[in-house]
Interface confidence: low
C-alpha cells in the first residue's frame, strides 16, 4: 500500500530573469527513493538517480542547475517558463509518487520567492 505523501512548494511566482528553486518532499513512507524525475508538462528537465547522480536534459543544461537536495534550480527565467512542473518520485517498493508545482513568471518586481522543503 502506498502510504507516502508529497509536499511541494505549491503555486509560486518569480521575476523574469531571476531564479527559483522547485522543491518536493516525500514523507510518511519508508520506501527507498531510487530516482526523481523533474518534468515540465511533457518535457523531461532533469533526472536525479540514486546511483548515477544527476542528468540534465541537453536543451535545458544552460538554465537548470541540480539541487539543493533533490530539488531543481531554474535560472534566467522567461515568461515562457510559466506553467506546471512535476516531481516524479520512483520508489521501492511503493512505486511512483507525483507532486505538482505551478510556476508563474512575472514581469514585475513583486514576485514571491517560493517556499521549499529540506530533504532529510
Amino acid at each position: 500500500m502506498m502510504t507516502g505523501t508529497i509536499e511541494t512548494t505549491g503555486n509560486i511566482s518569480a521575476e523574469k530573469g531571476g531564479s527559483i528553486i522547485l522543491q518536493c518532499h516525500l514523507s510518511s513512507t519508508t520506501a527507498q527513493v531510487t530516482q526523481v524525475n523533474w518534468e515540465q508538462q511533457d518535457q523531461l528537465l532533469a533526472i536525479c538517480n540514486a546511483d548515477l547522480g544527476w542528468h540534465i536534459s541537453p536543451s535545458f543544461k544552460d538554465r537548470v542547475a541540480p539541487g539543493p537536495g533533490l530539488g531543481l534550480t531554474l535560472q534566467s527565467l522567461t515568461v515562457n517558463d510559466t506553467g506546471e512542473y512535476f516531481c516524479i518520485y520512483h520508489t521501492y517498493p511503493d512505486g511512483t509518487y507525483t507532486g505538482r508545482i505551478f510556476l508563474e513568471v512575472l514581469e514585475s518586481s513583486v514576485a514571491e520567492h517560493g517556499a521549499r522543503f529540506q530533504i532529510p
Epitope: 531564479s19 527559483i20 528553486i21 542547475a65 541540480p66 539543493p68 537536495g69
Partner: antibody, heavy 116, light 107 residues
Framework: QVQLQQPGAELVKPGASVKMSCKAS????????INWVKQRPGQGLEWIGD????????NYNGEFKSKATLTLDTSSSTAYMQLSSLTSEDSAVYYC?????????WGAGTTVTVSS | DILLTQSPAILSVSPGERVSFSCRAS??????IQWYQQRTNGSPRLLIK???ESISGIPSRFSGSGSGTDFTLSINSVESEDIADYYC?????????FGGGTKLEIK
C-alpha cells in the same frame, strides 16, 4: 527602501537565553525567506538556518538545531532567533539576511556577548 | 556538508590591478555559488549570484565564473574601496555553507 533592522547588542550571562529580532521593511515580508548567520570575532560566516514567513517553514543547520529557534511575528514583519544555554562559544555577531539560496539584503547584525 | 575552500587567505594588490579570488567546493555544485564582500565592521554584501549573475548596484568591475567545483571572483581594476574580506557561499545542498574567506589588501 528594503531594510532589515537588528538591535545593536545583547549582553547575557552564561547558561541564559537570548531572543534577538530582525524587523523587515520596504518589501512584502511574507514573500522572502529570512536567514540567520553567525560570525565569531575575526572568523568567517556560518549559516544557522532560515524561516519562510509565508508559511512558517524552517530549516536548520544541524550544528544549531539544539541551540537556535527561529520564529516570526508576521503582524509586525519581524523575525526572531532565540539562542539557548549560552556559552562563550556563542559570543558572536548574528546577522539576519533575506533570500532563497542567495542573501541579497543583510541586517547590521546583533553583537551577543556572553559574560558573567 | 559541502566544504568550500578559499585561497589564498590574503591577497595583496596594487590599485588598478586585476585580482582573482578562488573558491573550491568539495563536490560538484553546478553554478550554485554566491560571492559576498564584507568590509571591516560591516555586513556582508552580495556581489554575484549563481556563479556569474550580476547584482543590481554592484560595480561592473566585479565578475564571477566557474562551474562544478572551481569558481573565481574577479575584480578587473581594483580600487581602494575594495579593501575587504570576500566569501563564497554554496546553495546546492543544505546546510548552506561559506568559504573561510580571502582578505584583500592594497599595496
Amino acid at each position: 527602501q528594503v531594510q532589515l533592522q537588528q538591535p545593536g547588542a545583547e549582553l547575557v550571562k552564561p547558561g541564559a537565553s537570548v531572543k534577538m529580532s530582525c524587523k523587515a521593511s520596504g518589501y512584502t515580508f511574507t514573500s522572502f525567506w529570512i536567514n540567520w548567520v553567525k560570525q565569531r570575532p575575526g572568523q568567517g560566516l556560518e549559516w544557522i538556518g532560515d524561516i519562510y514567513p509565508g508559511r512558517g517553514i524552517t530549516n536548520y543547520n544541524g550544528e544549531f538545531k539544539s541551540k537556535a529557534t527561529l520564529t516570526l511575528d508576521t503582524s509586525s514583519s519581524t523575525a526572531y532567533m532565540q539562542l539557548s544555554s549560552l556559552t562563550s562559544e556563542d559570543s558572536a555577531v548574528y546577522y539576519c539576511s533575506r533570500g532563497l539560496g542567495y542573501f541579497d539584503v543583510w541586517g547590521a547584525g546583533t553583537t551577543v556577548t556572553v559574560s558573567s | 556538508d559541502i566544504l568550500l575552500t578559499q585561497s589564498p587567505a590574503i591577497l595583496s594588490v596594487s590599485p588598478g590591478e586585476r585580482v582573482s579570488f578562488s573558491c573550491r567546493a568539495s563536490q560538484s555544485i553546478g553554478t550554485s555559488i554566491q560571492w559576498y564582500q564584507q568590509r571591516t565592521n560591516g555586513s556582508p554584501r552580495l556581489l554575484i549570484k549563481y556563479g556569474s549573475e550580476s547584482i543590481s548596484g554592484i560595480p561592473s568591475r566585479f565578475s564571477g565564473s566557474g562551474s562544478g567545483t572551481d569558481f573565481t571572483l574577479s575584480i578587473n581594476s581594483v580600487e581602494s574601496e575594495d579593501i575587504a574580506d570576500y566569501y563564497c557561499q554554496q546553495s546546492y545542498r543544505w546546510p548552506y555553507t561559506f568559504g573561510g574567506g580571502t582578505k584583500l589588501e592594497i599595496k
